[in-house]
């Protein structure tokens, strides 16, 4: 339904508060280096303009597209050329090329200072002094660091952020109340950002069909009682929502997400029995709750899949009549029967089935050719099952930190060209799969683990794409979305890698390490471990363990010393020499 003024339409649908918040997020995700005050000024100007259009939809410029209006506004920034370099060239383009240009310049790893959390009293004062600015600052800081963060979900995070301060700044022990809540929001926020980044990568790098296949599988697992037509409708609507958000169309995205939540709640009887509680919540909580809702119970009397997809003589006829619909039905039927499989495994099975039909339906006797197609699934199912079993055993034996270290060594040997900070970040996140998923029973392990690994490996892929250094990473990232994890798992030690020259500076530590949090100290040690492997890729586990144990003892000893700095200088030289000898550097 066409509206005379798109900006007025969205302002009225979303309300002023959400409109302003979403425009701020959009601008911060595009111009990630701009100061907060500049963005607030731009947002206020857009909001005032939107109000004039609400009053009179025929007013000047009110008929322009949102991309035109927002792009024109972004292109008024005076320092665009010196701050963003070639991104300023986007402003010479016309829509839709200009928006595409802005999207291409989004930076997954912007050069921004780490967010340092002030003292609780300082934060509470700032919150009370100007609540609106305080919350806008939160949106701005998250959005510019996470340029693909799911905007309507960020509104939900901001609501929880506000609630935490409202409650805790009045508490007797403000810190005890607030800090755990902020930690939880930070961790959940990083996870949410990474999950959304995979959705956008799926759409942008592999196309709508790939995203729709993912959505069919996931929604069929979640809503196994829903009919295929219902799942298909939800998939179409969900694809539109994520296409809009990933494309920077945040107002449309938030509006459509609200409509989808409304539709789901109005039709919960034909979708899932688990939606009742979600649907009683206010909008932002409702949408979040639906997105996270547990899988409904599988219908009791589902017939065997083989009848329709293997034994029937009409398989090729049905496939010819509507290939994607038939494959979609296969994926739906398989996924609703297998909440115990990862989405990526289900997609691999569907791809195998498709490949088999492509080959067999061209044969004179197709049925004879595809009769054993389900036998081809067995090794595809067993591979992730075995991998998860082995790695959960290793995790239980080592604990999270040492499990991360094992993965650090494993991945550094596979792709040693990748930057050390990226290897540390990705391997630490890969290692978190243990505490996240290994506690689950068998039936929940694979969907937890392999779908989480897909999210983490996508982080590696998007970071590597910015500055490509490894053909092996590029290959695993670009060849197949669903085979990324098996591709990385299959990589052996890179025999072509020329070891990095030894640099003592890399292994020089100072007393400041003693004041770091446990997490930061781990990162320092893990950074050193990656550098060790880059210097000596053929070092054995035993050699690396010995050096790392010595290193831990050295840090502990010097942090207890009276003259810490002298200890680090003198003992550090000895440690470097001993390590060089132990590793034959």
């Amino acid at each position: 339904d066409a509206h005379k003024s798109e900006v007025a339409h969205r302002f009225k649908d979303l309300g002023e508060e959400n409109f302003k918040a979403l425009v701020l997020i959009a601008f911060a995700q595009y111009l990630q280096q701009c100061p907060f005050e500049d963005h607030v000024k731009l947002v206020n100007e857009v909001t005032e303009f939107a109000k004039t259009c609400v009053a009179d939809e025929s007013a000047e410029n009110c008929d322009k597209s949102l991309h035109t209006l927002f792009g024109d506004k972004l292109c008024t920034v005076a320092t665009l050329r010196e701050t963003y370099g070639e991104m300023a060239d986007c402003c010479a383009k016309q829509e839709p090329e200009r928006n595409e240009c802005f999207l291409q310049h989004k930076d997954d790893n912007p050069n921004l200072p780490r967010l340092v959390r002030p003292e609780v009293d300082v934060m509470c004062t700032a919150f009370h002094d100007n609540e609106e600015t305080f919350l806008k600052k939160y949106l701005y800081e998250i959005a510019r660091r996470h340029p693909y963060f799911y905007a309507p979900e960020l509104l939900f995070f901001a609501k929880r952020y506000k609630a935490a301060f409202t409650e805790c700044c009045q508490a007797a022990d403000k810190a005890a109340c607030l800090l755990p809540k902020l930690d939880e929001l930070r961790d959940e926020g990083k996870a949410s950002s990474a999950k959304q980044r995979l959705k956008c990568a799926s759409l942008q790098k592999f196309g709508e069909r790939a995203f729709k296949a993912w959505a069919v599988a996931r929604l069929s697992q979640r809503f196994p009682k829903a009919e295929f037509a219902e799942v298909s409708k939800l998939v179409t609507d969900l694809t539109k929502v994520h296409t809009e958000c990933c494309h920077g169309d945040l107002l449309e995205c938030a509006d459509d997400r609200a409509d989808l939540a409304k539709y789901i709640c109005e039709n919960q009887d034909s979708i899932s029995s688990k939606l009742k509680e979600c649907c009683e919540k206010p909008l932002l909580e409702k949408s979040h709750c639906i997105a996270e809702v547990e899988n409904d119970e599988m219908p009791a009397d589902l017939p065997s899949l083989a009848a329709d997809f293997v034994e029937s003589k009409d398989v090729c006829k049905n496939y010819a009549e509507a290939k994607d619909v038939f494959l979609g039905m296969f994926l739906y039927e398989y996924a609703r029967r297998h909440p115990d499989y990862s989405v990526v495994l289900l997609l691999r099975l569907a791809k195998t089935y498709e490949t088999t039909l492509e080959k067999c339906c061209a044969a004179a006797d197709p049925h004879e050719c595809y009769a054993k197609v389900f036998d081809e699934f067995k090794p595809l199912v067993e591979e992730p099952q075995n991998l998860i079993k082995q790695n959960c055993e290793l995790f239980e034996q080592l604990g999270e930190y040492k499990f991360q270290n094992a993965l650090l060594v494993r991945y550094t040997k596979k792709v040693p060209q990748v930057s050390t900070p990226t290897l540390v970040e990705v391997s630490r996140n890969l290692g978190k799969v243990g505490s996240k998923c290994c506690k689950h029973p068998e039936a929940k392990r694979m969907p937890c683990a392999e779908d989480y690994l897909s999210v983490v490996l996508n982080q590696l892929c998007v970071l590597h794409e910015k500055t490509p250094v490894s053909d092996r990473v590029t290959k695993c990232c670009t060849e197949s979305l669903v085979n990324r994890r098996p591709c990385f798992s299959a990589l052996e030690v890179d025999e072509t890698y020329v070891p990095k020259e030894f640099n003592a500076e890399t292994f020089t530590f100072h007393a400041d390490i003693c004041t770091l949090s446990e997490k930061e100290r781990q990162i320092k040690k893990q950074t050193a471990l990656v550098e060790l492997v880059k210097h000596k890729p053929k070092a054995t586990k035993e050699q690396l363990k010995a050096v790392m144990d010595d290193f831990a003892a050295f840090v502990e000893k010097c942090c207890k010393a009276d003259d810490k700095e002298t200890c680090f200088a003198e003992e550090g030289k000895k440690l470097v020499a001993a390590s060089q000898a132990a590793l034959g550097l």
Partner: nanobody, 115 residues
Framework: QVQLVESGGGLVQPGGSLRLSCAAS????????MSWVRQAPGKGPEWVSA????????RYAESVKGRFTISRDNAKKTLYLQMNSLKPEDTAVYYC????????GSQGTQVTVSS
């Protein structure tokens, strides 16, 4: 929208010949094996012959082997059945199908063999 339109049937004397055609549209014809199936009055469908997508592999029911020849022209998206030495028991509605299906998705063409 998949469409299969058969033609070429008719009344023929025993020992005579007919050439049936099946014009296909709405799918990638050359990527699919095709079959001819027939259904005599009061009987179930009977598979007659099949051909692979490239036209290299052909299969026949024992009852028609040596008398019928299946072929295809992928450029014209058309399937053929050359029927020689026709017998009264060949009387049926003939229809073409995709893959090994015996489900009737088209009108078919009537073949009557009678003196």
């Amino acid at each position: 929208q998949v469409q299969l339109v058969e033609s070429g049937g008719g009344l023929v004397q025993p020992g005579g010949s007919l050439r049936l055609s099946c014009a296909a549209s709405g799918f990638t014809f050359g990527s699919f094996g095709m079959s001819w199936v027939r259904q005599a009055p009061g009987k179930g469908p009977e598979w007659v012959s099949a051909i692979d997508g490239g036209g290299a592999d052909t299969r026949y029911a024992e009852s028609v082997k040596g008398r019928f020849t299946i072929s295809r022209d992928n450029a014209k998206k058309t399937l053929y059945l050359q029927m020689n030495s026709l017998k009264p028991e060949d009387t049926a509605v003939y229809y073409c199908t995709i893959g090994g299906s015996t489900s009737r998705g088209s009108q078919g063409t009537q073949v009557t063999v009678s003196s």
